[in-house]
């Protein structure tokens, strides 16, 4: 999906209002400095691409993030403010339902959510501090 035509201001508002709090709740008891940055993004559409990938694509050591509250809200926000996004996700959701895993917050998942927080922080800053 090409995130170029999303309403970035509305997505930012949703993130600040709800998604960020759910991410921080998930990370409770863990310092963000416990994990080094292993993923970055270079503009707002790129940030959303990487956010979608980390949130919804299961990885071998962290398969269950898509069921978390922050993921559900992320999905709703993207569906609301990115034209045509929900249509592209129907097949992906059906495939995900077949992969039921028990809910365990592993250190690898904490690391992945830490990276998500970093990506969202980059998304909400429209410019570098300078230049």
């Amino acid at each position: 999906y090409d995130f170029t035509n999303c309403d970035f201001q509305k997505i930012e508002a949703d993130y600040l209002r709800t998604i960020s709090k759910d991410l921080i709740t998930y990370m409770s008891g863990t310092k963000s400095t416990d994990f080094n940055n292993t993923v970055s993004c270079s503009n707002r559409p790129h940030c959303l691409t990487e956010i979608q990938s980390l949130t919804f694509n299961p990885t071998p050591r962290c398969a269950s993030l898509a069921k978390e509250m922050f993921a559900r809200k992320t999905k709703a926000t993207l569906a609301l403010w990115c034209p045509g996004y929900s249509e592209t996700q129907i097949n992906a959701t059906q495939a995900m339902k077949k992969r039921r895993k028990r809910k365990v917050t592993t250190n690898k998942c904490l690391e992945q959510v830490s990276q998500l927080l970093g990506l969202w922080r980059r998304f909400i800053r429209t410019l570098l501090k300078k230049q």
Partner: antibody, heavy 122, light 108 residues
Framework: QMQLVESGGGVVQPGRSLRLSCAAS????????MHWVRQAPGKGLEWVAV????????HYADSVKGRFTITRDNSKNTLNLQMNSLRAEDTAVYYC???????????????WGQGTMVTVSS | SYVLTQPPSVSVAPGQTARITCGGN??????VHWYQQKPGQAPVLVVY???DRPSWIPERFSGSNSGNTATLTISRGEAGDEADYYC???????????FGGGTKLTVL
């Protein structure tokens, strides 16, 4: 852990070519800008080139423009530097480094490789 | 092209504060990064975006930037701080990385 490992250095005669490689691991390579930086013996750091996270744009130092070519392969997590028409003044340790970027601005180089030595001598 | 000027050397007594400067035309409008390099080793980022510090760098390292001068401050200097220090910026007008000439810090 996050790592950059350079290879391909060696001794080469003036006018000849050499290809350096940098293997990245432990991070999502395709999301970072990548640089080559060199350091002549006993001298300071000199920036050589940078390639955008997606390979869509490239910039070179004036001293190497037209002779060096930076490329990346995001499917293999590798960065390359093709060095042609080498001169004695290209003798240096060559480092690769990663850099987050925001639009067309590159940020700090937060991870560096250990370097590979290139000696240009007849 | 943009030029960054550093003093070739700075000395500090153990336990005292060292300040390394980096001069450039209106450098305060740019984000400055600082690297430490020990002999035979690769550079290590110690301060980025003027004053931010990577999580693995001690709080003794700090930075500031305004006007025509950026400054790296190392408080309570230790023997292990002996190294070369380089400032760096991204010059948007030329799309080039620019490094300062480097400063050798000696802990007396």
């Amino acid at each position: 852990q996050m790592q950059l490992v350079e290879s391909g250095g060696g001794v080469v005669q003036p006018g000849r070519s050499l290809r350096l490689s940098c293997a990245a691991s432990g991070f999502t390579f395709r999301t970072y800008g990548m640089h080559w930086v060199r350091q002549a013996p006993g001298k300071g750091l000199e920036w050589v080139a940078v390639v955008w996270y997606d390979g869509s744009d490239i910039h070179y130092a004036d001293s190497v423009k037209g002779r060096f070519t930076i490329t990346r392969d995001n499917s293999k997590n590798t960065l390359n530097l093709q060095m042609n028409s080498l001169r004695a003044e290209d003798t240096a340790v060559y480092y690769c480094s990663r850099s987050p970027q925001w639009e067309d601005i590159f940020e700090s180089m937060d991870i560096w490789g250990q370097g590979t030595m290139v000696t240009v001598s007849s | 092209s943009y030029v960054l000027t550093q003093p070739p050397s700075v000395s500090v007594a153990p336990g005292q504060t060292a300040r390394i400067t980096c001069g450039g035309n209106n450098i305060g409008s740019k984000s400055v990064h600082w690297y430490q390099q020990k002999p035979g080793q690769a550079p290590v980022l110690v301060v980025y975006d003027d004053s931010d510090r990577p999580s693995w760098i001690p709080e003794r390292f700090s930075g500031s930037n305004s006007g025509n001068t950026a400054t790296l401050t190392i408080s309570r200097g230790e023997a292990g701080d002996e190294a070369d220090y380089y400032c760096q910026i991204w010059d948007s007008s030329s799309d080039h990385v620019v490094f300062g000439g480097g400063t050798k810090l000696t802990v007396l």
